[in-house]
Amino acid sequence: DAHKSEVAHRFKDLGEENFKALVLIAFAQYLQQCPFEDHVKLVNEVTEFAKTCVADESAENCDKSLHTLFGDKLCTVATLRETYGEMADCCAKQEPERNECFLQHKDDNPNLPRLVRPEVDVMCTAFHDNEETFLKKYLYEIARRHPYFYAPELLFFAKRYKAAFTECCQAADKAACLLPKLDELRDEGKASSAKQRLKCASLQKFGERAFKAWAVARLSQRFPKAEFAEVSKLVTDLTKVHTECCHGDLLECADDRADLAKYICENQDSISSKLKECCEKPLLEKSHCIAEVENDEMPADLPSLAADFVESKDVCKNYAEAKDVFLGMFLYEYARRHPDYSVVLLLRLAKTYETTLEKCCAAADPHECYAKVFDEFKPLVEEPQNLIKQNCELFEQLGEYKFQNALLVRYTKKVPQVSTPTLVEVSRNLGKVGSKCCKHPEAKRMPCAEDYLSVVLNQLCVLHEKTPVSDRVTKCCTESLVNRRPCFSALEVDETYVPKEFNAETFTFHADICTLSEKERQIKKQTALVELVKHKPKATKEQLKAVMDDFAAFVEKCCKADDKETCFAEEGKKLVAASQAALGL
């Protein structure tokens, strides 16, 4: 499978359009501050070079690795040191260290302006004037803000983005057609980015074994009729795809993902009965569809797990012969029987089983020692079940906004050192679990909720890693991937925290709040709530709720006033003074 020229091989496999798009994504994910025009220039140079290699694979430099070619190209950027500081030192290194260096400098929270959506007519004009540039700009803006976005999936988003403009810019009411589609793409895009970020964190922080365990559990739930060998093959291939994408090898990743989709569709009879529709779609839609496909029905008469994994006299022998294979089989068998469990719960059960075998297979009477291992699973299963039940009840009682506020208070008290924007973003996302998952029946609630919470808590972990401020966050994030959520759930109020000094500026508001969207206004109020808790961590829920109601009354009053700015200035001072007096700020 060795090719004389890797770049020619990928260009031919992917085609010029996808090749150029993927190189643009790769470059934008590495050099997140570079202007669009600079990236386009670099991409065009790489593409022209690739074409010379397609014409003659023996041409000069065509035998170089993609990392060497792309790294050399990135290192030609003139302003590297001024713009990126120490990242410029990467260019002094040789491959593969240079690429590793670039990867380490990817910024999950780059200092980039918020993307402001222009008027619909302005967007449609730009789309019609230069469709290619318009779509490239979309790829560039998403990729630089989401440096771990799953590149082949971003191509699928770009295809949908193009389709939305093609359809809606001809519609009678362009805005009514286009805006809901763009909102949907934005929300799905954020979710997709966060899910992929967890996959990359899993691989990079916990290693291939952790990712493979996750993949065995998820694919076994999704394809319960597939044999273990088939699931193992899919896991191996999927691990390769995600390792490549997370490592910046986007061309190889996209190529291998296409091969995997092809393999799955050619072998769907031995994988899942739910793949038929997916496999009739074009490549990008097909891959997306497979990744989202619903769980197949469980085979009718699966035997009890106890026979092979508890009662058999060969348990320790089978375990000793091939530990990871045996544990993989346990995970496969348990997961295919439990689509109602979250993946992280299944992994906790497998870890408990592994720990028990490690201990018991060295004991005098192994069977006697591990005979009750399944009893140890009960509390592990009940903990997330109870937590989800309680939180769904709270969500149904409060609604999403107030549920988010309850979580904001809860998490600010747990980890008050974390920055306010991070606490607001993470708590808002945690709160979305309610509308996302609580509507589901019992059998679907846990996989929906706990696996979603894993994705959101990973956002907290990667943002915190950039500027660590809390030992408790570091501990929960690094000790165990599958126990992150229980670790955060178990945190109580941080009694060591010294309340933040009061700063009136933090609680100063202006008339611009009146023209904000409902979402932006909520974020302003939630930011104030976090700051309030940081100043007064001992305030009761009732006091915080009452102060927030005062804040709402203040905003409502001033937004109705003739002289809004004066009202905000004068009444704002009164609000702060009143809250100080009442809470002793």
Partner: nanobody, 124 residues
Framework: QVQLVESGGGLVQAGDSLRLSCAAS????????MGWFRQAPGKEREFVAR????????YYADSVKGRFTGSRDNAKNTVYLQMNSLKPEDTAVYYC?????????????????WGQGTQVTVSS
């Protein structure tokens, strides 16, 4: 269940003063803002004043600003409305209400529990 009982209404001359009281029982009084509203015959119920949970912040309708003062005594579970320089147009049934968990602070729909009202009549 929350109970609110207003008192202190009556018939007065223009320019006189009255002090309305509202005694509350039920859920924790100090956790919620309280509102005073009024309703004149044939008119909608209108906002008069909002007294916050701690009594440290009060908002008024423009029509009563400078003449009416709201206050509360959380130890006594009571909220007050001191009305000075009364005018004939202040004639109405005055209600006290306890804030709900959502909705506008200046609209009756944002308040959950209501008293039965006390009549205030200002003659010229």
């Amino acid at each position: 269940q929350v109970q609110l009982v207003e008192s202190g209404g009556g018939l007065v001359q223009a320019g006189d003063s009255l002090r309305l009281s509202c005694a509350a029982s039920g859920r924790t009084f100090s956790d919620y803002a309280m509102g005073w509203f009024r309703q004149a015959p044939g008119k909608e119920r209108e906002f008069v004043a909002r007294i916050n949970w701690s009594g440290t912040l009060t908002y008024y309708a423009d029509s009563v600003k400078g003449r009416f003062t709201g206050s509360r005594d959380n130890a006594k579970n009571t909220v007050y409305l001191q009305m000075n320089s009364l005018k004939p147009e202040d004639t109405a049934v005055y209600y006290c209400a306890q804030r709900g968990d959502s909705g506008s602070n200046y609209d009756p729909s944002g308040y959950r529990y209501w008293g039965q009202g006390t009549q205030v009549t200002v003659s010229s």
